[in-house]
């Protein structure tokens, strides 16, 4: 999987969208690694 900063941000956006945004407040691009996915 792509692990660039932009890929991580888009992937997290998709995850947040699918979860309805119900995730921890600290679940943001700069403090989740690719392993979080």
């Amino acid at each position: 999987a792509c692990d660039t900063a932009t890929c991580v941000t888009h992937r997290l956006a998709g995850l947040l969208s699918r979860s309805g945004g119900v995730v921890k407040n600290n679940f943001v691009p700069t403090n989740v690694g690719s392993k979080a996915f």
């Epitope: 792509c2 660039t4 900063a5 941000t9 997290l12 947040l16 943001v28 691009p29 700069t30």
Partner: antibody, heavy 119, light 107 residues
Amino acid sequence: EVQLVQSGAEVKKPGASVKVSCKASGYTFTDYYMNWVRQAPGQRLEWIGVINPYTGRTTYNRKFKGRATLTVDKSASTAYMELSSLRSEDTAVYYCASLLIRPHYFDYWGQGTTVTVSS
Amino acid sequence: DIQMTQSPSSLSASVGDRVTITCKASQNVGTNVAWYQQKPGKSPKALIYSASYRYSGVPSRFSGSGSGTDFTLTISSLQPEDVATYHCQQYNFYPYTFGQGTKLEIK
């Protein structure tokens, strides 16, 4: 409203350094990566590097490694790009850009800073 | 580094025309491609991400497609305000790289 406001135009001599600032507002600065991109006259956009404002970790384009330095001041929500050993080919418009998820899922760019390198 | 080759480098079309700009990557970048619109003297504005997804607020006449090495930006019905230079970008690998730009003019 999300804004990335960059510092003003600079004129530098060959061999000098320049430091461009990018002040972020309207979102949580440390949550999103900050990219730096430049555009020389008549040339394609060129990615310089990216910084994680939360950790300070950087990734650079090999072309600029050793000459470009990306830093942040978290307390001021400001990112900086310093380029050293300037040459005429570094004459360009320099942009900061950040891809956000909140408050809006969008790729925001600063207004650009013109750096002219001339003897 | 990944080379992004855009074509054409410039084009002239009439209002209402369907316009297609292509971008070819030198190796597989999946769908990790973005498209930007840049008007003279302005910063690039994001249009498309992940090859085919429009950002909110981008008119529906703009669409993107492709995967692997071949990508397309289509404007279904050209409007006067679409006069600009369009750039593709791959973000699958560091360093991110851009196409050389396509300058779009109205006939």
